[in-house]
């Protein structure tokens, strides 16, 4: 099998002249192309991979929302020679992008990385943008994170920074098959210079709750703040961190839990992020809207391609 091969970061790499063809190894019977697009209120960019793939032929389109950052994922696999150049890698112009003067700044200021390389999106190097409210949504938080796309044995990742709706999210993410958009939010002018090491604690929320090991034979019970999930038995060396979810009402789902228990050693997660079960490789953080197939790609259903691992 012969497939097209390229890796695109922002709008470079899968540009027309840079297309390669590769002969796939034995046992490889699909060509793959995957595109992940990210929209902030100040612009959009995409990452893409073409090459020899694995799995079955078919299509998978998905739309995801992370605190007002929109992600659109498309995966197409096919079994004919050089069949993997069907997806359009060129993005349509964003409505707000390039027309920010029409919007009233809301006072928030964030660093913006839209299609910038990691080198150009370091610390205070990237441009600063004024946030504004759009589509009836309030964008007063700043975001620092990454978009990662894995396909055809290649992983491509770009930084994402910009204005978001949430001001306190921590290591939050949405995923599709081989696609992840994740990062943290903050409050304050240009606070998103580097949130990689942001902890789960917020100044408004009590931080760490240590669960002492049981001292009696009788099982101790603990109020779980309206969550029906209880901790499983864990080694006494395990510390459980209680992470209150900070998602606002606008993105909570009926399945969302108030507490997330993270156990540091061998014990299984109890609770955890209740994602959208069922769709292969999707999972994802609780309560993030899945705009599956609807807004950007109407009528483009197709086979759901089994993912090898959620991200």
């Amino acid at each position: 099998l012969e497939c097209y091969s390229c890796v695109q970061k922002a709008d470079d790499g899968c540009s027309p002249h840079r297309m390669k063809t590769v002969k796939c190894g034995p046992g490889v019977d699909v060509c793959t192309e995957a595109v992940g697009a990210v929209e902030t209120i100040h612009g959009q960019f995409s990452v893409a991979v073409r090459g020899c793939g694995s799995g079955i032929p078919g299509k998978n389109d998905r739309g995801l929302d992370l605190h007002g950052l929109l992600a659109f994922f498309q995966l197409q696999q096919c079994s004919e020679d050089r069949c993997n150049a069907k997806l359009n890698l060129t993005l349509r112009g964003l409505n707000p992008a390039g027309n920010e003067s029409a919007y009233e700044p809301n006072g928030a200021e964030c660093y913006s990385c839209v299609g910038l390389s990691r080198e150009k999106c370091q610390g205070s190097m990237p441009p600063v943008v004024n946030c504004y409210n759009a589509s009836g949504r309030v964008y007063k938080g700043c975001f620092d994170g990454n978009v990662t796309l894995t396909a055809a044995n290649v992983t491509v990742s770009l930084p994402v920074r910009g204005c978001v709706q949430d001001e306190t999210c921590t290591r939050d993410g949405v995923t599709g098959p081989g696609f992840t958009l994740s990062g943290s939010c903050c409050q304050g002018p240009r606070c998103n210079a580097d949130l990689r090491n942001k902890t789960y604690f917020s100044p408004r929320i009590p931080p760490l709750v240590l669960l002492p090991p049981p001292t009696t034979a009788a099982p101790s019970t603990r109020a779980q703040n309206s969550s029906s999930t209880t901790s499983t038995a864990a080694p006494t060396t395990t510390t459980s961190i209680i992470k209150p979810t900070t998602a606002q009402a606008s993105h909570t789902s009926p399945h969302e839990m108030d507490l997330e228990v993270i156990q540091e050693e061998g014990a299984s997660l109890s609770g955890g992020a209740a994602g959208h079960g069922g769709t292969a490789g999707h999972g994802g953080a609780a309560g993030h809207q899945d705009r599956s197939n609807m807004e950007k790609y109407p009528g483009k259903g197709g086979a759901q391609i089994p993912a090898k691992g959620g991200s």
Partner: antibody, heavy 117, light 112 residues
Framework: EVQLLESGGGLVQPGGSLRLSCAAS????????MSWVRQAPGKGLEWVSY????????YYADSVKGRFTISRDNSKNTLYLQMNSLRAEDTAVYYC??????????WGQGTLVTVTS | QSVLTQPPSASGTPGQRVTISCTGS?????????VHWYQQLPGTAPKLLIY???KRPSGVPDRFSGSKSGTSASLAISGLRSEDEADYYC???????????FGGGTKLTVLG
Amino acid sequence: EVQLLESGGGLVQPGGSLRLSCAASGFTFSNAWMSWVRQAPGKGLEWVSYISSSGSTIYYADSVKGRFTISRDNSKNTLYLQMNSLRAEDTAVYYCAREGLWAFDYWGQGTLVTVTS
Amino acid sequence: QSVLTQPPSASGTPGQRVTISCTGSSSNIGAGYVVHWYQQLPGTAPKLLIYDNNKRPSGVPDRFSGSKSGTSASLAISGLRSEDEADYYCAAWDDMLNGPVFGGGTKLTVLG
């Protein structure tokens, strides 16, 4: 119908400057990678510069790096080439070309730039 | 000196088949980049003839065909006609130069 129309060529002295324009119509300009390609009299084709659809990715041939600047105005459907510190060897017909199916699928008619003292 | 090497000239009589070669290196054709061919009739702008090694844009007769192997590519014109008299250029992306490169061009003359 796709059309590319270059303008701005002319006679200029060595060390001088010119700005070429390419007006595009008949396709979604803001979605297309665009290039400038030149052809010296009686010679072959030489790629000059390359700009991505959004304008954020740009490449130049070594022979023009630091002297020429490619840009685009998607709201005006126009591609530009600012040429500074012109040399005699820059004398050529300059074509603007659209990137289509992994190739330059449409070309303008060209505009002649003559650098002479 | 062009990065892609083409013979400066080629010729044939009407109805004949002619082949024009294009030799590159490991940084362009040999790196797997697809090859394109352009036809430039006298006094006109170049026109895309073959893209992606062997595909023809609509309107290009099937007398024109392309192929690629290793670090070289070739353009074949069968059933040669007088209107095929033109300059032909191959092109491909080059990793070293970070841009598309052209062959020096081959002037095709249709004899008789």
